[in-house]
């Protein structure tokens, strides 16, 4: 799906506030703090332009920022392994001035039996072994150290944890005579955290466990365990938070039911049910106890596990997620979409929106896409005029202020951003879609017509003429 999408830059807008660094006391580590913008709200554009100019002029002074790469560290504890028994690891870029740590869990589906794991090993070995991992990786999107690309947390310590356990980061079983593969996703996270404590994490103020796709689900499954681990190791003051991107799936009815023969056609509930047994999967204790023995698979679904979590979690989810559609056996092949399928897709968006209504920190654009936070142009999409980095900044502020009595949302700083328009790409800031076959970019109108939406039908509920609607969609209102 990656090849089908491109990201377009929106018109120049002032970026969300960069994280400005406070002047440290002598001998103290530098730390960033949230800015209070209430005094400048009337003239925000000019103020932001000055802040950006200042940030850009100071940026070259920081020599450590010039190297964008995260460097590979294989785990010292070699008993914590990838599927094939090679040591797991992580990529790290330290930012010694910051007490923020971002740990990112990579995604990449899963396998749940010997047959489809063998097939995965043949075709996607990098997701099962560390043998061919490159020595360095470039941080992109939320892992970028460039304030222009990452206005949210550019100065954080960045950690990328490659996905090589094929178990949605839930497994706790090692390779043995009996087990051809190890599934140690949950243990890999614990070991990475343990080793990072010796590399500066011990001084952290905030640890943000983020992830995309299977990594996003991994966040939901592991964020409380990381907090508990740090507490047990004597670091109760580190605030652990989660950022789950494209990992909030529904256990809904497939568009067309197919037997569970491979990863992609198998209904998610059945795949996870089989997977948990195969991986010796672990789920958060507070979720597990809500379900009967053998029903732990429920905890892989965001809307069921989220209410049981202690740590704050920000949920990012496309309303029309491509991975969700894939497991639901919806394949957009380039042929115009029949009405039954169109209604199914619209209903999916409606169901997903419903599951997010009690998630205070969420960002859900009405787009057909998958993953966002480590894409370079992750700043481009907006919901109700707010970009994702801005929403994350507002979330930080709301958590920073949460010990105060006020529970009301910060004025002009929203954190619950869920599109309410009902069809894919009704949000004009969605990533541009390319035709699968020609590679041509499609505008929103072309895409909707390709999807089988009659513009008259789409415009009518909005009280608009089709021409008015097309104009609005094209100019981004």
């Amino acid at each position: 799906s990656e090849g089908r999408k491109t990201w377009r830059r929106r018109g120049q807008q002032p970026p969300p506030p960069p994280r400005t660094e406070a002047a440290p006391a002598a001998g103290q580590p530098v730390e960033s703090f949230p800015l209070d913008f209430t005094a400048v709200e009337g003239n925000m554009d000019s103020f932001m332009a000055q802040v950006k100019s200042l940030a850009q002029s100071l940026y070259p002074c920081s020599a450590q920022q010039l190297n964008e790469d995260l460097r590979l560290h294989l785990l010292l504890n070699t008993s914590v392994t990838c599927n094939d028994g090679s040591p797991a690891g992580y990529y790290l870029k330290e930012s010694r001035g910051s007490r923020r740590w971002l740990l990112f869990l990579e995604g990449g589906w899963y396998c749940f039996n010997r047959e489809n794991c063998d097939s995965r090993y043949d075709t996607m070995r990098r997701l099962m072994s560390s043998r061919d991992w490159p020595r360095t990786r470039t941080g992109t999107g939320i892992l970028s150290s460039q304030p222009e690309e990452n206005p949210y947390w550019w100065n954080a310590n960045m950690v990328f944890i490659p996905y090589c356990s094929s178990d949605v980061w839930s497994g706790a079983s090692s390779k043995s005579e009996k087990n051809e593969y190890a599934f140690m996703g949950a243990l890999i996270i614990q070991e990475v955290v343990r080793e990072l404590l010796g590399r500066g994490l011990s001084g952290a103020k905030v640890l943000l466990l983020a992830g995309s796709s299977a990594g996003g689900t991994g966040v939901l499954l592991n964020v409380d365990r990381v907090a508990e681990q740090l507490e047990k190791l004597g670091y109760p003051a580190i605030q652990v938070r989660g950022l789950a991107d494209s990992g909030w799936f529904l256990d809904n009815k497939q568009y067309r039911h197919t037997d569970c023969v491979d990863t992609i056609t198998c209904a998610p509930t059945e795949a996870i049910r089989r997977g948990i047994r195969y991986w010796n999967g672990v789920v958060p204790e507070r979720c597990r106890r809500q379900f009967q023995e053998g029903e732990e698979w429920n905890c892989f679904f965001g809307y069921k596990v989220y209410p049981t979590l202690r740590c704050p979690v920000f949920v990012v989810q496309w309303l029309f997620d491509e991975a969700q559609l894939t497991v639901d056996n919806v394949h957009l092949t380039g042929q115009p979409v029949q009405e039954g399928l169109r209604l199914y897709i619209q209903n999916l968006g409606r169901e997903l929106r419903h599951t997010l209504k009690d998630v205070p920190a969420s960002f859900a654009p009405a787009c057909l896409s998958h993953e966002i936070i480590i894409r370079s142009h992750w700043t481009d999409v907006q919901v109700k005029g707010t970009s994702l980095p801005r929403a994350l900044h507002c979330w930080d502020r709301s958590l920073h202020d949460s010990h105060k009595a006020s529970k009301t949302p910060l004025k002009g700083c929203p954190v619950h951003l869920v599109d309410s328009c009902p069809w894919p790409h009704c949000n004009p800031s969605c990533p541009t879609v390319r035709d699968q076959f020609t590679g041509q970019e499609m505008n929103v109108a072309q895409f909707l017509m390709h999807m089988g939406f009659d513009m008259q039908t789409v415009a009518q509920p909005q009280g608009l003429e089709p021409s008015e609607l097309l104009g609005m969609l094209s100019n981004g209102s």
Epitope: A237, R288, R289
Partner: antibody, heavy 118, light 114 residues
């Protein structure tokens, strides 16, 4: 509205086994956990154990070897069994509904008195 | 196990007076990641079962009069009754639900009316 009602034997002899039933209404045992708490005469509250919505149990380690909690979701009943009764098990026994995910006891039964005496 | 201590064990006040009782835990009940304190207060009137008054250290349950206020963080907590009424005669218990098993209660503070 939410209600819990305990029913127990009242008087028992040492070394016997205790069985108390808690019948609930106004909520489902498949959605909420139920805890057992006791209070010796003139003393404070002691948490004994919990049965979660999914059926798993946790016990106070001081009594774990003598305690067993179970339930019947369809009958909306929770049961506590305690064997090898001693005189210091004399207490008022309460069942309490928990809020969904934490050990907050938001509704309590009226309690049932157990006297252990020879 | 987390040990909960309450003081005073009893006190007698006149109607209309302000009352403060404290609860101390042997370890912090503040979960730093969500800034919540896992502490509840219960009221037990003579011959009745306990009733939940306050959860999360300071969140008053619906139907609880606003003269009852919970405060504090970490290991030190307070329940304040701003102006005592005759019906407030009861034993008040604090309870931690930060860590289990077991969840533990304080020994109680008995409030008597002069």
């Amino acid at each position: 509205q939410v209600q819990l009602k305990e029913s127990g034997p009242g008087l028992m002899a040492p070394s016997q086994s205790l069985s108390i039933t808690c019948t609930v209404s106004g909520f489902s045992l498949t959605d909420y956990g139920v805890s057992w708490i006791r209070q010796p005469p003139g003393k404070g509250l002691e948490w004994l154990g919990v049965i979660w919505a999914g059926g798993s149990t946790d016990y106070n380690s001081t009594l774990k070897s003598r305690l067993s909690i179970s339930k019947d979701n369809s009958k909306s009943q929770v049961f506590i069994k305690m064997n090898s009764l001693q005189t210091d098990d004399t207490a008022m026994y309460y069942c309490a509904k928990q809020n969904r995910y934490d050990g907050i006891f938001d509704y309590w039964g009226q309690g049932t008195t157990l006297t252990v005496s020879s | 196990d987390i040990v909960m201590s309450q003081s005073p064990s009893s006190l007698a006040v006149s109607v209309g007076e302000k009352v403060t009782m404290t609860c101390t835990s042997s370890q912090s009940l503040l979960f730093s990641s969500n800034q919540k304190n896992y502490l509840a207060w219960y009221q037990q009137k003579p011959g009745q079962s306990p009733k939940l008054l306050v959860s999360w250290a300071s969140t008053r349950e619906s139907g609880v009069p606003d003269r009852f206020t919970g405060s504090g963080s970490g290991t030190d907590f307070t329940l304040t009754i701003s102006s005592v009424e005759a019906e407030d005669l009861a034993v008040y218990y604090c309870q931690q639900y930060y860590s289990y098993p077991p969840w533990t209660f304080g020994g109680g503070t008995k409030l008597e009316i002069k």
